[in-house]
Structure formats: structure tokens, C-alpha cells
């Protein structure tokens, strides 16, 4: 609450997050134009990469593009994308939502589409839908450990969300426990009124914000955390805006001397931790 | 403007960007002691990062040192390191610019000059200037979409500088266009009255200040983004305090059984996006 | 100090790191059985990550768990893991601790021991202590440079830490060369008041706070930074809640064509730069 | 059904050489260990060397140096070079592989045996 009479300070923050869970994924893998069943575990190596303090990635869901290499190939037929003949490829063109620079050239794509040949990472990804449901729609009981460490230098005080008196296996709950800083994702989600199985297909950014209203003086002292959630990126987001929340990252390697990649689109939650609030003193 | 009645609060922000465009590259390769012309085509897995939100980095140049092994080499002969005798090499010594251990012996580098030998990532990475013009230079049209959520905790207040009215194919303009959201790298630096073209040789840094004045009252309700640009690094810094932006990173790999590296230094435009502002109530 | 007349204004920042230096890192290697004395040569490419301006991570300390592959295999014995039968291992179970799914099945992980069989990246990670001494002990030596913008925009005033009287090859010091911008990791950790090597081992977070009390009225103009340091993570954890800082991370490879990695524990410090302050104008 | 079919074995003389091979057959997921073993006349099975998906390996102490355990994951397939044979390597060799069927349902399979005779 405000008290006038006091010299307020914003906070200076710190944050270090851990992640821990393991996810099976089933999904069909397709090897020498065989398909077949592939099952594998993901843990925090293979979803999460190393990040800064206030932010934290988990994957929930990919496509792969395996096998690329730099040569021509026809661009993927989406809409507005297909040719009849060369006329409609313009030598050395970059379309924005293309992968590659066209060579002037239609050429055919499969037995009934042509499209424009390009110079590109070939065969070019294929523009399909995020798999349904998520491929580590488990990661919602995965766990995330918020650790918060803040300081308001005017008034030279630092403490943290952590006490010693915490116990180590406790679990968030806004009721019972709020003061606990081990997170399961699918409750960060509950708590923002959002589901974590459909947010998982398309990703999203998941806000925790972490406020501190601290009262510093001997006589009344108070400084703990309060923690709530919010959804930051806009579920409602027209198709051109990119919906969602995903990236693309790739796996370079050498076959037969020839440089070729994976290519993957990552698609996961961004957990942005927010950290605000002000320390007063008389 | 400033409304002295009004309880002002700092901004909350979140942003998400998205960089889309390819660039093609012609460069000299040289394999097997041939120089030929290598033509290659990069795409946002590429030349992008997968990093936070506030910064978002795009490569611009680079220089490559390919097949380097743990072993002993003659250090590179920039100023000042070039020897005659095993005397002017300490054994064990780590010169803080080069970029291995010496041994204590001086050893021919070439036909011409003698270094230190040191042990080291071998060869060692030639100190060459960044290639002019940039390899990239083609990045001055690729567009990035920067969506921002904001956050007033005091006030209840969320919006967001994407509204549902908007259409995904602007171009953001100061005049024409000022709401748009989408910003074409090489607009953002001549806003800034830097030369892209230049600055993506070296690198540097480059601010994106999203400036949110919001009047929450009813009766004279308004918030929505002012965008304005500003370049970040120092263009007439010392040379010893390392001008523009550059990193080295590197693609480890296996080849008859010896761990060897391919070590990049990119260069590159790092986009910092600042977000500040205040809202005012009653 | 507070002029009350002034009209404050926070610091909007922009921060910018390079680390130098190389480490001799000496350790055990295992090939093919055989045990031999390993001797490698780290620099900036190995030991650090292309991170954001406000953090930058020096690695200081690895454990590295090459080779895994997805099959099955026992899990680690650590405490409380341990099985006498197929009973005391349920199919499907994750448990947290633990990297991967169980099979329902208890199978000997050595002579003497026998775990329960899971589907995971094998050999499952040993849950081994960081070497002590830590690898890269000789980071203490490194050097890093911070180049700092900052900007009042209200006041429409931007200035940086790095002069152009400053000179590239000085080195902080609280007494004799407090402007300088060039720091000694182990310096940073010495003001701190904390021992580098101690917590080089476990990994830590150190706090380099930069704090602007700015002046800018022209009669008594005065803008300078003042650099601070502590640390941020907290020394006397309790082990549940992870001490020290580290993540996993992955390099992939196919060999036999079976998709392997080579996972690291990457202990280290990462280092958060804190600006703060107000600019004040009449 | 999941079959191992193994070959390769037969007599020879003291210091030569064999290559056994087993290959697994049929519908399945996924081979994990895969392993020799042998039963020589009035003695009980022993393991000679096994190998992981990811290739690694493990001995017997007695074929230490002298016999190699390989693997094709792309055949399923199991090798084991033995040179330097002695007589005391006389026994029927077995192959063995711990077979996903479907996802987390392993199975122990093994071959039928092959003979393998080193005269002196």
C-alpha cells in the first residue's frame, strides 16, 4: 500500500530458472521411403537451450526438414505459388515468403503441380501444419525452479525469493503454498486460464510476473514475492502477424563432402519472467 | 505530457521478434589448394540466432577458419609478434592477442616470416580484415515483425502494439505509416541517419526505442507506441576497444577420428529493443 | 545526491561484452578403455556462448557424458535407485530424478548393483561431483570489456562509459582506474569479496552493477558510471534447490546410423550487468 | 515372429580365424544390446562380448585382444571376428539381442546356435 511519507525505490533484479522433466515422443519417421514408428525421450538438452536469466524456451512441438543441401529445386506449391510456364518465374526474384532466389525457370514440383526453380536449401521445407496434438504435449508436468534475487541499492538491501527455511520438493499453488518457487507448467498455464495442450501446438509466451512490495522499515518490515501469470503473445492473432511462437534453428553436417542441414521449426512456450516492484523507507 | 495529478507507472514490456528474408552470397572458396567462386544462399536459420526478446541478432559478415585441430603452429605474424630466435618465446606464455599456449620455440610461419609456436586450435585464425563489401550486404531488405505486450500491474492495464485492425503486409514509414509494426532493416538505419551498407562490414549495434506515453483516464484515454532509432555502438571508437559487433563461435565435428572445428566470426547488427514509457490515472 | 528541484528520469541502457583469454585445460580422457592424460586448448569459442548484452556466461568447470544413444539401458544407482527385483520397477514411470522411462524391469548396472532398465539417452548420465580443482580454473585471468549506451530520453542525453581519452589496454581498479571498462574476472570476484577458484567449481552468478547519478544541468554537469559487484546466487543453498550454475547442453552426430550425442554440463558463471540510476535536469 | 538367424560357424585350426554373423528378422521397433555367448560340452553359457546400440563394447577376459563384436544398425546385424582361435574356444556360440517390440516392450531373443571347433 502507499505510504506517502516514504522514499520509494524501484527493484534491480536477478533471475535463474532450471527446468527438469522428460518427454516421450512418438511420431513416424520416414527412412529410405519407409515409414515407420520412432519413439524417443527428450530431456532438458534436446527442448530447452541455454538462455538468459529472464527468459526460459521449453520446445513443445517441431517439424523437421532433414537432409537439405544448397542446390535447385522447385519452390513448395503454396497458395498463389504454382506456374504454368517460365513467364511467370523472374530470374534472380526473392519472394519474402519463399526460401530461395527463382532461376526464371517452372518446373514441376510432383505429377500434378509446377512451381518456380529456385536456388535454395533443397528440397524446400514444406509449409505443413504444426503436428496435433503436440509432440511434447508432457512437458505441461514438467517443473520449472524460479530463483530471484533482488536488490534496491538506495536503501543497500538485497534479499531473495528463496529462504532457507523452503523446503525443496514443494510445488506451487497459489493457495497453499505460494511462497513455493518450483513451478509445474501445466498449473502456470491453469492459473493464466489457458490450456496448455492447445498453446503446445503453436506455441506461445507464457508471462510470470514476480512483484515485490517491500516495505523496509524496521518497524513494519515486509518483502516477499507475489507471483502471477499472464498470457503475452495474442491467441487471436490474424495469420500474417505469425501466431504463436516458434523458431528456426538447424543441424549442419558433411555427407559424401557435400554440406548439408537439418532444418528445424521449433514451436514451444517463451516463459518471460517479469520482475517489478519498489522497496520504501522512512 | 506531463498531467502532475496523474499516479504515473513504469512500463511492463514483452516483445517477440521475427526476421524474415534471404540473402545470397558469392564468395572464394578455396578446397584443395583451388580458389573457385562458392554461391550460397542463406535463410533466417542461417544467419539469425534463436535469442531473447529484447535483442535480436542478424549476421551481416563473416570470416571462416575451417579444419582447425588441437596441435602445435606458428602463431599468426600480426605487429609485433614475429621472431628470429627461440629467445623472444617463453614457454607457457598466453599473449593475451594470440591465441594459443607458446612453447618456447620460434618456427617458420611462411616462406618469409618466423613466429612463436604455440599450442593451439592450428592453423590459427588469420587476423584478415572482414570482407568489403559485406557478404550479407543483401540484408538491408530483409523485414522483421517486433510485437510488444505491455503491462501497467497498478493501473490493470494491458495492450498490445499489434491491433487487430492492422495489416500484415505494412511497412512501417514515420510519416505514412507509423502504427505498422513491421520494419525494414535498411529503413531502421537511415531513420537513424547510418549508412547499412557500411556499418554491415564490421557490425554494431543498432536501438529500436518503443516509447509508450499512455493516458489511462477514461475522458482522454490514449496508448499506443511511438517507435524512434538510434545506433548504439560507438562508430569512432579506438581500435583497441574492439569497433562494431562481432562474435566467434564454432561447428565441431569428427573426421578420422580427430575432433577438429570450424570457428566463424560473425559480424553483425545486433537490434536492441527499448521499451519505456509511463501511464498515468487519477 | 537528491536535488529535489531536478526532474528525475531512469537510465534506458544498452549493454555490450567481449570476453579474451584462453585456458589450458588438462583432464583424464577415456578411449577405447584406455585411460590417458587429455591437454586441450579453450578460447572464447569454446568457453562462452553468443549471449544477450545484459549476460554473458563464462564456462569454467564441464562433465561431459559422451556417445549416448535412445535404447535402454540400467539407470544410474544414485541413492535410493537401487532394485532387488522386477517389482520395485513400474513400466511407464518417470521419475523425476531420474532420465528416462521404465521399462518394469530391474538389470544389473555393474557387478554389484542392479537398476531399473529405462528407454533413455545411454550410458544415462552419472551423476558424478564437478572436478575440483575445475578445468578452467585460468579463467580467473580472463579479461572482459563492457561497453556501455545509455540515453534520457526525456532529457535527450546519451553518453557511454568508454571515452575517447580511455585507453584500450588498462585495467579496472577500484582505486587507481575506476573508468576503465576492462575488468579481471578474478578482480571482479576479489572486490566481490568471493573466491573465484571456489566457485569456479560448482558455478555461480556474479552481479556487475553500473550505477549512473547523473547531473545534467550545464552549471554543475556531472555523468560518469560507478561500478559495483556481488554476488547473486546464494553460496549456503540447499542442495535440493541446485547451488551454483550450470545447464546441459548437446552436440548430435550420427555414427552407424544411429543419431548420438555427446552431452555437457556446462558449470560456469554467468555474469549479469545491473544499470541503473536517474538523470536529473533542472 | 522375431527370428536371430545366425551363421558363420565351422572348424578350424588352431591360430585361424571365423567370422560369425547374426541378423534379427521380422517386425519389431527397435534392437538394443546385442550379445555372443557360448556353451562349450558340460559347461554352463558365458558371455563373450556384447555391444550397445551406441557401440560400445565389453569382453570376456579369456577373448580380450583377440576377438572384435561389431554391429550394422541399418541390417540389424551382429558380428563377431574371432582370430587367434584356440582349442578352448570350442563351443556352441549363441547370439542374443534385447528386441523392442513395440515401445518399452523389450524382449530376449536368442539364436539357435552356431558350432564352432578349433583343432589343434
Known amino acids: 500500500s502507499d505510504k506517502l511519507y516514504q522514499r520509494k525505490e524501484p527493484v534491480i533484479s536477478s533471475v535463474h530458472t532450471k527446468v527438469k522433466g522428460i518427454a516421450e515422443v512418438t511420431e513416424n519417421v520416414t527412412e529410405g521411403g519407409v515409414t515407420k514408428l520412432g519413439h524417443s525421450i527428450f530431456d532438458t538438452a534436446d527442448y530447452t537451450f541455454p538462455l538468459q536469466g529472464n527468459s526460459f524456451f521449453v520446445m513443445t512441438n517441431y517439424v523437421k526438414s532433414e537432409g537439405q543441401v544448397q542446390t535447385l529445386c522447385p519452390e513448395y506449391p503454396r497458395r498463389g505459388a504454382q506456374c504454368s510456364s517460365d513467364r511467370r518465374c523472374k530470374k534472380g526474384w526473392m519472394d519474402p515468403q519463399s526460401k530461395g532466389i527463382q532461376t526464371g525457370r517452372c518446373v514441376p514440383y510432383d505429377k500434378t503441380r509446377k512451381t518456380c526453380e529456385v536456388s535454395a536449401w533443397c528440397p524446400t521445407e514444406e509449409e505443413k501444419e504444426a503436428p496435433r496434438p503436440a509432440l511434447l504435449r508432457s512437458a505441461e508436468n514438467f517443473t520449472v525452479l524460479i530463483k530471484n534475487n533482488i536488490h534496491f541499492p538506495g536503501h543497500n538491501y538485497t534479499t531473495r525469493n528463496i529462504l532457507p527455511t523452503m523446503n525443496g520438493s514443494c510445488t506451487f499453488h497459489k493457495t497453499w503454498d505460494p511462497q513455493c518457487s518450483i513451478f509445474r507448467l501445466g498449473d502456470i498455464f491453469q492459473e493464466a486460464g489457458e490450456n496448455f495442450t492447445e498453446v503446445a501446438v503453436q506455441g506461445g509466451i507464457m508471462g510470470i510476473e514476480i512483484y515485490w512490495d517491500c516495505n523496509l522499515d524496521s518497524w513494519s518490515h515486509h518483502c516477499r514475492p507475489r507471483y502471477s501469470f499472464r498470457r503475452l503473445d495474442d491467441k487471436n492473432m490474424d495469420e500474417s502477424f505469425v501466431p504463436g511462437y516458434n523458431f528456426r534453428y538447424a543441424k549442419y553436417y558433411k555427407e559424401n563432402n557435400v554440406e548439408k542441414r537439418t532444418l528445424i521449426k521449433a514451436f514451444g512456450i517463451r516463459f518471460d519472467i517479469l520482475v517489478f516492484g519498489t522497496g520504501g523507507k522512512f | 505530457s506531463d498531467k502532475l495529478y496523474q499516479r504515473k507507472e513504469p512500463v511492463i514490456s514483452s516483445v517477440h521478434t521475427k526476421v524474415k528474408g534471404i540473402a545470397e552470397v558469392t564468395e572464394n572458396v578455396t578446397e584443395g589448394g583451388v580458389t573457385k567462386l562458392g554461391h550460397s544462399i542463406f535463410d533466417t536459420a542461417d544467419y539469425t540466432f534463436p535469442l531473447q526478446g529484447n535483442s535480436f541478432f542478424v549476421m551481416t559478415n563473416y570470416v571462416k577458419s575451417e579444419g582447425q585441430v588441437q596441435t602445435l603452429c606458428p602463431e599468426y605474424p600480426r605487429r609485433g609478434a614475429q621472431c628470429s630466435s627461440d629467445r623472444r618465446c617463453k614457454k607457457g606464455w598466453m599473449d593475451p592477442q594470440s591465441k594459443g599456449i607458446q612453447t618456447g620455440r620460434c618456427v617458420p610461419y611462411d616462406k618469409t616470416r618466423k613466429t612463436c609456436e604455440v599450442s593451439a586450435w592450428c592453423p590459427t585464425e588469420e587476423e584478415k580484415e572482414a570482407p568489403r563489401p559485406a557478404l550479407l550486404r543483401s540484408a538491408e531488405n530483409f523485414t522483421v515483425l517486433i510485437k510488444n505486450n505491455i503491462h501497467f500491474p497498478g493501473h490493470n492495464y494491458t495492450t498490445r502494439n499489434i491491433l487487430p485492425t492492422m495489416n500484415g503486409s505494412c511497412t512501417f514509414h514515420k510519416t505514412w505509416d507509423p502504427q505498422c509494426s513491421i520494419f525494414r532493416l535498411g529503413d531502421i538505419f537511415q531513420e537513424a541517419g547510418e549508412n547499412f551498407t557500411e556499418v554491415a562490414v564490421q557490425g554494431g549495434i543498432m536501438g529500436i526505442e518503443i516509447y509508450w506515453d499512455c493516458n489511462l483516464d477514461s475522458w482522454s484515454h490514449h496508448c499506443r507506441p511511438r517507435y524512434s532509432f538510434r545506433r548504439l555502438d560507438d562508430k569512432n571508437m579506438d581500435e583497441s576497444f574492439v569497433p562494431g559487433y562481432n562474435f566467434r563461435y564454432a561447428k565441431y565435428y569428427k573426421e578420422n577420428n580427430v575432433e577438429k572445428r570450424t570457428l566463424i566470426k560473425a559480424f553483425g547488427i545486433r537490434f536492441d529493443i527499448l521499451v519505456f514509457g509511463t501511464g498515468g490515472k487519477f | 545526491s537528491d536535488k529535489l528541484y531536478q526532474r528525475k528520469e531512469p537510465v534506458i541502457s544498452s549493454v555490450h561484452t567481449k570476453v579474451k583469454g584462453i585456458a589450458e585445460v588438462t583432464e583424464n580422457v577415456t578411449e577405447g578403455g584406455v585411460t590417458k592424460l587429455g591437454h586441450s586448448i579453450f578460447d572464447t569459442a569454446d568457453y562462452t556462448f553468443p549471449l544477450q548484452g545484459n549476460s554473458f556466461f563464462v564456462m569454467t568447470n564441464y562433465v561431459k557424458s559422451e556417445g549416448q544413444v535412445q535404447t535402454l539401458c540400467p539407470e544410474y544407482p544414485r541413492r535410493g535407485a537401487q532394485c532387488s527385483s522386477d517389482r520395485r520397477c513400474k513400466k511407464g514411470w518417470m521419475d523425476p530424478q531420474s532420465k528416462g522411462i521404465q521399462t518394469g524391469r530391474c538389470v544389473p548396472y555393474d557387478k554389484t548393483r542392479k537398476t531399473c532398465e529405462v528407454s533413455a539417452w545411454c550410458p544415462t548420465e552419472e551423476e558424478k561431483e564437478a572436478p575440483r580443482p575445475a578445468l578452467l580454473r585460468s579463467a580467473e585471468n580472463f579479461t572482459v570489456l563492457i561497453k556501455n549506451n545509455i540515453h534520457f530520453p526525456g532529457h535527450n542525453y546519451t553518453t557511454r562509459n568508454i571515452l575517447p581519452t580511455m585507453n584500450g589496454s588498462c585495467t579496472f581498479h577500484k582505486t587507481w582506474d575506476p573508468q576503465c571498462s576492462i575488468f579481471r574476472l578474478g578482480d571482479i570476484f576479489q572486490e566481490a569479496g568471493e573466491n573465484f577458484t571456489e566457485v569456479a567449481v560448482q558455478g555461480g552468478i556474479m552481479g556487475i552493477e553500473i550505477y549512473w547519478d547523473c547531473n545534467l544541468d550545464s552549471w554543475s554537469h556531472h555523468c560518469r558510471p560507478r561500478y559495483s559487484f556481488r554476488r547473486l546466487d546464494d553460496k549456503n543453498m540447499d542442495e535440493s534447490f541446485v547451488p551454483g550454475y550450470n545447464f546441459r547442453y548437446a552436440k548430435y552426430y550420427k555414427e552407424n546410423n544411429v543419431e548420438k550425442r555427446t552431452l555437457i554440463k556446462a558449470f560456469g558463471i554467468r555474469f549479469d550487468i545491473l544499470v541503473f540510476g536517474t538523470g536529473g535536469k533542472f | 515372429e522375431v527370428q536371430l538367424v545366425e551363421s558363420g560357424g565351422g572348424l578350424v585350426q588352431a591360430g585361424g580365424s571365423l567370422r560369425l554373423s547374426c541378423a534379427a528378422s521380422g517386425s519389431f521397433f527397435r534392437v538394443n544390446n546385442m550379445a555372443w555367448y557360448r556353451q562349450a560340452p558340460g559347461k554352463q553359457r558365458e558371455l563373450v562380448a556384447d555391444?550397445?546400440?551406441?557401440?560400445?563394447?565389453n569382453y570376456a577376459d579369456s577373448v580380450n585382444g583377440r576377438f572384435t563384436i561389431s554391429r550394422d544398425n541399418v541390417r540389424n546385424t551382429v558380428y563377431l571376428q574371432m582370430d587367434g582361435l584356440k582349442p578352448e574356444d570350442t563351443a556352441v556360440y549363441y547370439c542374443?539381442?534385447?528386441?523392442?517390440?513395440?515401445?518399452?516392450?523389450?524382449?530376449?531373443?536368442w539364436g539357435q546356435g552356431t558350432q564352432v571347433t578349433v583343432s589343434s
Open positions: 555391444i550397445t546400440r551406441g557401440d560400445r563394447t
Open positions: 542374443y539381442a534385447r528386441i523392442e517390440l513395440g515401445v518399452l516392450v523389450p524382449r530376449d531373443y
